[in-house]
Structure formats: C-alpha cells, structure tokens
C-alpha cells in the first residue's frame, strides 16, 4: 500500500494509472467503500462522500490512462485509505494529513516561549524535527517547545514530519518582538548633547503601546522615572517627563530620546520598557551613559569618568603628541603641576578610544581654557 503525506489546508494529488493509455472507467472510493468520484465517458461524476465539494480529478490526463484524485483544502479527518478501481484492479493509497500550528500568535516577545503543536491522524506515530532560523534543531512528538526566544529566532522555522519513512515539510514564520540591541552604551564629554536611540528589530503595520524610561544614576541611591510615553500607530506622544533632566522625545519611530547635556549627575544606567497592546510582557532595552570631565584646579589636572565603565578600560592623561603621563584602570587620574600645553584625557579599550576630552593648560600665571 502506497503512503502519501499531506498538509492541512494544502491540496494533494493521489495517482492512479491504468495499463491502457486511454480514457476508461475508474472510481475512487474511501475505506468505507463510499464513492468519491469517477467518470462516465468524458464526464466527472461525484459520489456522496464528505469530500464532495473538495474532490476533483484532472480530465486532461484521462486519455493517457491517468486518473488522479485531487483533494483540496485538506483536513486531518481526510486521512484514510483511498481505493482506485480501474481495469478490474484496485490501487490502494493511504493518505495521512498532518497540521502544525504555533500555540498562540506567531508574534512573540523576546524571552517568551514558542510551542508548536502537531495535529495528526489517529493511529499515526510521527516524529517532528524543527530547524530555527539560526540553525538550532529541536525534536519532539506531538508538541515542541522552545523557551526563552531570542531575536535570532525571528524568521522561518522549517519543520519536518516523518511518518512511514515519508516526510512532509512545514514552514512557520515567527516574529520575535524585541529591540535591535539588548544594551547600548553612550560615551560623552560633560556638556555634550546625548542621543539615545531604541530601534525595534521588527516591523508591523500598526504598533500601539506605552513605554517608560527608568534611570539609575550612579550618584543616586534609587532609580527614577525620566519619561513615560504612549505609542499609537507608530506615533509617539509623551505623557510625563521629569523636570531634571528635561528629556526630549522624537514623535516617530525609532524611539529617540535627547538629553540636552551630559552631566556627571546623569551618568548611569537606564531601562526603557515598552508594553505592546494585546501582548503580555514588555520589551526591554538597557542604555548606559558614561560622562567624562577634565578640569584644572590650581596645580592639579584631573580627568574623571562617571557611569558604568568596565574594569578593563584605561583612563589616561597625556600632553598632545607625547607619551601618556598617567594611564590607569581607574575612574579618575590626575597630574600634579602639569606643564603648559594641550592635554588629552582618553578613555580607551584595547587601543580603541571611547571618549576623549581636551583641556588647555596655560603657563602658571594664566587661567585654564576648556575647548
């Protein structure tokens, strides 16, 4: 008996071939011997089966001795043994119809779980293997679960159902709702304008929700809400903003915040959360601000950084075009009695300068100038 696998919702074509290459009488029946369709001369006739409106054949092939049964919009319950009667012969074909669906919406928040459920006919014992867009394989029986979805899980999942050494492939498009970056860090000199951007890693027709940026300044004992906003069809409207600092927010996506001035008291870490309509849970993006200040007080030239710096970073003070006078893994370095000239304060990571601030040291009788 030939086995054919079909996909729920698809169309399947079951073949039946006569030895004579001409149009002769044929019938297709199900296992209950109920006629599905056949022919009467060059006409297609249909029986009283449940498939009536979904069954068809290809009349153009009859002259070649081919009498296929075409079943459209397959259902799991179409799984059955189909018998083709032609030339006093019976050809049996076992059709097994499978369906694979995502448990919920195919738009899931980062960190949520994806469950894929296999619908299969009674008596079948299929195995399923799914490959994620990033190449990760998961195996299972009737259900497959992937916990903690990541951004790289967005895309087409390819699932193969194996039964009787035959296979059928399903493709499911999954969209993981997340920010493009889980975390970002902005390095600024004191007084510079700060731009925070929160690009989303997905596009949808309509995007509605609400968000908030909480900020934990390094110098503060507790975090505070800097801004709250609403999102309606990709339009941003600010609901509330703190007085200090006075943040500005762009009206369109991507979410964009401007801090007028980088100041030591603002250095720290923020967490932007976005709750989307009809979704449980929130999207998160961490943002960090590091602020540098170079100052000269009397005979002491000091360079300081505030904010979440890594212990691998090196802070240096050097006179322009000269060797570093001091270079330490600290958040503050200083030089006593600095010689006159343009001094550079550098925050670097393995040679990559992340932040630079220049300060001009004038001869001792003058006062310093900060460019």
């Amino acid at each position: 008996k030939k086995v054919v696998l079909g996909k729920k919702g698809d169309t399947v074509e079951l073949t039946c071939t006569a030895s004579q290459k001409k149009s002769i009488q044929f019938h297709w029946k199900n296992s209950n011997q109920i006629k599905i369709l056949g022919n009467q001369g060059s006409f297609l006739t249909k029986g009283p089966s449940k498939l009536n409106d979904r069954a068809d054949s290809r009349r153009s092939l009859w002259d070649q001795g081919n009498f296929p049964l075409i079943i459209k919009n397959l259902k799991i319950e179409d799984s059955d043994t189909y018998i083709c009667e032609v030339e006093d012969q019976k050809e049996e074909v076992q059709l097994l119809v499978f369906g694979l669906t995502a448990n919920s919406d195919t738009h899931l928040l980062q960190g949520q779980s994806l469950t894929l459920t296999l619908e299969s006919p009674p008596g079948s014992s299929p195995s399923v293997q799914c490959r994620s867009p990033r190449g990760k394989n998961i195996q299972g029986g009737k259900t497959l679960s992937v916990s903690q979805l990541e951004l790289q899980d967005s895309g087409t999942w390819t699932c193969t159902v194996l039964q009787n050494q035959k296979k059928v492939e399903f493709k499911i498009d999954i969209v993981v709702l997340a920010f493009q970056k889980a975390s970002s860090i902005v390095y600024k000199k004191e007084g510079e304008q700060v731009e925070f951007s929160f690009p989303l890693a997905f596009t949808v027709e309509k995007l509605t929700g609400s968000g908030e940026l909480w900020w934990q300044a390094e110098r503060a004992s507790s975090s505070k809400s800097w801004i709250t906003f609403d999102l309606k069809n990709k339009e941003v409207s600010v609901k509330r903003v703190t007085q200090d600092p006075k943040l500005q927010m762009g009206k369109k996506l991507p979410l964009h915040l401007t801090l007028p001035q980088a100041l030591p008291q603002y250095a720290g870490s923020g967490n932007l959360t976005l709750a989307l309509e009809a979704k449980t849970g929130k999207l998160h993006q961490e943002v960090n601000l590091v602020v540098m200040r170079a100052t000269q007080l009397q005979k002491n030239l000091t360079c300081e950084v505030w904010g979440p710096t890594s212990p691998k970073l090196m802070l240096s003070l050097k006179l322009e075009n000269k060797e570093a006078k001091v270079s330490k893994r600290e958040k503050a370095v200083w030089v006593l009695n600095p010689e006159a000239g343009m001094w550079q304060c550098l925050l670097s990571d393995s040679g990559q300068v992340l932040l630079e601030s220049n300060i001009k040291v004038l001869p001792t009788w003058s006062t310093p100038v900060q460019p």
Partner: antibody, heavy 117, light 113 residues
C-alpha cells in the same frame, strides 16, 4: 579555541631589522589587543607594546619607542612586530599574546631572534 | 613604571608539600574605582610560552588545577601551590596590569627537593 601561531626563528646581523608575524585563529580577531613580550636567554619577561586588532592603534614601551613598529592585516588576522637597529642584546624569544583586560590569556609559541655578527 | 619584585628567586619543595611565592608592587595595583587587584600569575616551563594561571589576583583561569591559588591585595600578593606535583616544576611570574606599561616580576624558579 584561540590559537596564536608565530613565524619561524630568525638570525640577523647587528643594525638589521627583523619582522615577526603572529596569526590568530579561533576567536574574534578585532575584539582584542595583541601584545609583544620578549625573553632574553635565561632572563625574565619584558613588554614591548601592543597593537589593537580593532583599529590598529599602538602603544609601545618607552624603551623601544622609535625602534619598534607593530602593524596588522585584518584580512589574514595577522599582526606583525618589526624591530630595527638590532643589537646583540635584542637576542631573545619574542612572544605575541592576546590581551582582553591587561593579563595575557593566550600566547604564541615564540620566535627566537638571534642577533650575531 | 610600577616595579614588581618577586621572592624568593628560587624555591625547592618536596612533592606533596606547599610552595609559596611572593610578589610585591612598588605601588598599589588595587583599583579604588573597580575594587579589583590588577595582578596576574603565569607559569613557564622550559621551551614553552608562559601560561596564565591566576588573574584579578585570585581568580583561577579555566583548566588550572585548584591546587593553585592566589591571594593578597594592594601591594602584596602570594601564589600558593597547596600540594606540589612533579609537573609544577617551572618558573612563575607575577604581572601587574593596573597601569601602563604592564610589568612583570623577575620570576621564581620552583624545583623539587
């Protein structure tokens, strides 16, 4: 697994230059600095400088300033250390080493440079 | 530059016994900003490059046997081999990476008594 593979031994005359290569594999080349450390026969370890694989920035020890040049080729994940105006006291094994924070977690096998007339 | 001084220059210890190597820096290598000691220990066997054993003064590199431990803070540091094995015969170096340039101690040769 990160690997640093250095070029073979060299014999040079005083006043000449030597160029030693160090090819990195098994890691993200651009995310760290490569340091050069030398060891004279029976002696301790001496730092020559580093080159950032990310952007080619260099930092040389004051002692070797003007005599040492470090370069990189990102297409082959290779860094080079050239030491000029060689003298007999430059005879040593030269090592390249990966630096993630300041300590050196992976080292090349070493290249013996002999300076002799 | 920070000067690193190791003691003793050489050390002979019986198999299974404890070996202790000291390292002193000319200035503190403890970062007040990050509360970390920027000190590493290396092992070097003849004809081989140095091998990282300990960093942050006391964090063991992965794959390093737990008989090796590092301690100390500020300017005084110790590498301890709790039970010396034959394969531990080598020269041991300390290195500071708190300030540039990084500097090494002169080395301590560990032998079997």
């Amino acid at each position: 697994q990160v690997q640093l593979v250095q070029s073979g031994a060299e014999v040079k005359k005083p006043g000449a230059s030597v160029k030693v290569s160090c090819k990195a594999s098994g890691g993200t080349f651009s995310s760290y600095a490569i340091n050069w450390v030398r060891q004279a026969p029976g002696q301790g370890l001496e730092w020559l400088g580093w080159i950032s694989a990310y952007n080619g920035n260099t930092n040389y020890a004051q002692k070797f300033q003007g005599r040492v040049t470090m370069t990189r080729d990102t297409s082959t994940s290779t860094v080079y250390m050239e030491l000029s105006s060689l003298r007999s006291e430059d005879t040593a094994v030269y090592y390249c080493a990966r630096d993630l924070v300041g300590h050196f977690d992976y080292w090349g096998q070493g290249t013996l440079v002999t300076v002799s007339s | 530059d920070i000067v690193m001084t190791q003691s003793p220059d050489s050390l002979a210890v019986s198999l299974g016994e404890r070996a202790t190597i000291n390292c002193k820096s000319s200035q503190s290598v403890l970062s007040s900003s990050y509360n970390k000691n920027y000190l590493a220990w290396y092992q070097q066997k003849p004809g081989q490059p140095p091998k990282l054993l300990i960093y942050w003064a006391s964090t063991r590199e992965s794959g390093v046997p737990d008989r090796f431990s590092g301690s100390g803070s500020g300017t005084d540091f110790t590498l301890t081999i709790s039970s010396l094995q034959a394969e531990d015969v080598a020269v041991y170096y300390c290195q500071q990476y708190y300030s540039s340039p990084p500097t090494f101690g002169g080395g301590t040769k560990v032998e079997i008594k």
